[in-house]
Structure formats: C-alpha cells, structure tokens
C-alpha cells in the first residue's frame, strides 16, 4: 500500500515537473515572439521602402548606426510606453552596448534636461533577473544601478547617464527604437 502511494506521489511529481517545463518553454516562446515581431516589422519596412528613396528614419526620430530612436514628449507608465512604441512599429529601447548608452545619454542632454525615460528593461517577478523585452539579459555593465524598493513590478529607465529602476506604474517619458531603413540606392 505504502509503495503504491509512493509511486503515485512520484508520478505526480514527474507530472508537475513536466508542467513547469512546459510553462517555462511557453514563457521563452512568448519572449522570442516579441523579438521575431521586431525583426519582421523591420524587414517589412525595409521591403516596402526599397522602391522609394526615403530617409533611414522617420521625421522626429534620431539615427545612430542601424537604429532609429524616438524620444517621447509624452509621459506613460511602462506598459503603455511599450504599446505606444509598438504602434509606431518599434519597441522600447534595448541598450546593447556602452557605445549605444553613450549615444542615448548624449542625445538626451541635447534634447532635454535631466528627465526619466523608460527603456525595454523589466525585472522578472520570480527570479529577480533583469530582462530586455526579447528575453535576453543585459550585459553586466548595463544593469540598473539601484534596486527599487517597490513591492510592485520593477522596470528600467534612463536618467542623465545612468540606468535606474522604478515601479513600472510610475509616469515617465520613454524611448522607442527600430531598425533604420536600408538605402535603396
């Protein structure tokens, strides 16, 4: 009888592990979808514009290498910021390198004073890991400098030349990013 109970418990445990694995796979799939969508949008934009001689970035967007950036003039909470960027065929800024960070902070200094700008960085509620919107982890030099004391979800923002963290429900400006169009020449 005891052996039977033990076997059932082991089977349940195995089932639970499989479900957890499936959930983890689904989460990873969801993250990769966001990245694929970003690439897909960029590809479509490049394809559609190849017939015309258009500038690499839309009006009011700033270009740096292969990227176009939009510095918002409106406040949003983090999730709405992401929605705003998506409507423009872009995503919240993902900072890949110190060079990109320097370009962004340098541009912000020229455009505006020392304001807060949401970027596409959020903290996973369970693991506490920082993740970009595509599911990748920021490089060690690009982790938010201070850990927010908020019990709510925590997201990353840029201020002056620092990457910081705050409750995702606070209102801030935001920065969108998309791929620059390839020249059709």
């Amino acid at each position: 009888k005891l052996l039977q109970v033990s076997t059932i418990a082991m089977q349940q445990q195995e089932k639970l592990i499989q479900q957890e694995r499936a959930l983890l796979n689904f989460t990873e799939w969801k993250r990769s979808c966001a990245l694929q969508m970003k690439y897909c949008q960029a590809f479509m934009q490049n394809s559609l514009s190849s017939a015309h001689n258009s500038s690499p970035c839309p009006n009011n967007w700033i270009q740096n290498r292969e990227s176009c950036y939009y510095v918002s003039e409106i406040w949003s909470i983090w999730h709405t910021s992401q929605e705003n960027c998506l409507k423009e065929g872009s995503t919240l800024l993902q900072i890949e390198s110190k060079e990109e960070m320097d370009f962004i902070t340098g541009s912000l200094r020229k455009i505006k004073g020392s304001y807060d700008y949401w970027v596409g960085l959020s903290q996973d509620g369970h693991s506490g890991r920082w993740l970009w919107q595509d599911g990748s982890s920021p490089s060690p030099g690009l982790l938010p400098a201070e850990r927010s004391q908020s019990a709510n979800q925590v997201c990353g923002y840029v201020k002056s030349n620092s990457l910081l963290s705050s409750n995702c429900s606070t209102w801030k400006y935001f920065i969108c990013e998309k791929y620059a169009l390839r020249s059709s020449v």
């Epitope: 409106i74 949003s76 705003n84 409507k87 423009e88």
Partner: nanobody, 116 residues
Framework: DVQLVESGGGLVQAGDSLRLSCAAS????????MAWYRQAPGKEREYVAV????????HYSDFVKGRFTISRDNAKNTVSLQMDSLKPEDTAFYYC?????????WGQGTQVTVSS
C-alpha cells in the same frame, strides 16, 4: 474625423478657480490615456496633466502640482481639469488630446486669463 472640443475657460482673478472640460465627437475617449496641454502667447505648447484610461492614475507637471486636478467621466465621455489657486502665469489657451505619440487633430482650445 475626430474633433476635440474644450470649454470652461474665462477671465478670473488670481486665486480663483475654473473647471475645464473636454469632449470628443465620434470617438470613445474611455480607452485612451488623456492629457491637458497649454500654450501661452509666444511660448511652446506644454504638458499640464495626464490621466490613465481607467482614471485611477494621474500625473502633473511641477508647475501645477497641488493646484490642478485632472479627472474623467467615462460614462459621459469627458475629461476635466479642475484649476484652483490660479496664478497670472497660468494664462494660456488650454487643449486636451490623447496621450499617445500620434495625437488627434488639435481642437480650438479654451482661453484662460488670470489677472492679478
């Protein structure tokens, strides 16, 4: 095409109050974050306040914090701006619009003049 209509402005004394209202034709405001802006003569349009679509979250520019209150009535499809302790520097045309990158065509605005 959507039309934003602002109302409630007027000429008041410093320290007085006014309540501005914003309505939209042919568009349901309840699904949008909404914002109030103002533009003084010879100056750029500036952000005043913003309210979330549900109305449970608001944010204000430093120069109006504690004096102005943004609210909304989703049943009536309106957004309001209660302005208390008005100052001469609040004199401007006030406009409402959706709080998104691509905004709707601007309305005529409503003029607020605060005399000292």
């Amino acid at each position: 095409d959507v039309q934003l209509v602002e109302s409630g402005g007027g000429l008041v004394q410093a320290g007085d109050s006014l309540r501005l209202s914003c309505a939209a034709s042919e568009r349901n405001l309840r699904i949008y974050d909404m914002a109030w802006y103002r533009q003084a003569p010879g100056k750029e349009r500036e952000y005043v306040a913003v309210i979330s679509s549900s109305g449970d979250s608001t944010h204000y520019s430093d120069f109006v914090k504690g004096r102005f209150t943004i609210s909304r009535d989703n049943a009536k499809n309106t957004v309001s701006l209660q302005m208390d302790s008005l100052k001469p520097e609040d004199t401007a045309f006030y406009y409402c619009n959706v709080n998104q990158i691509r905004q709707w065509p601007w309305g005529q605005g409503t003029q607020v003049t605060v005399s000292s």
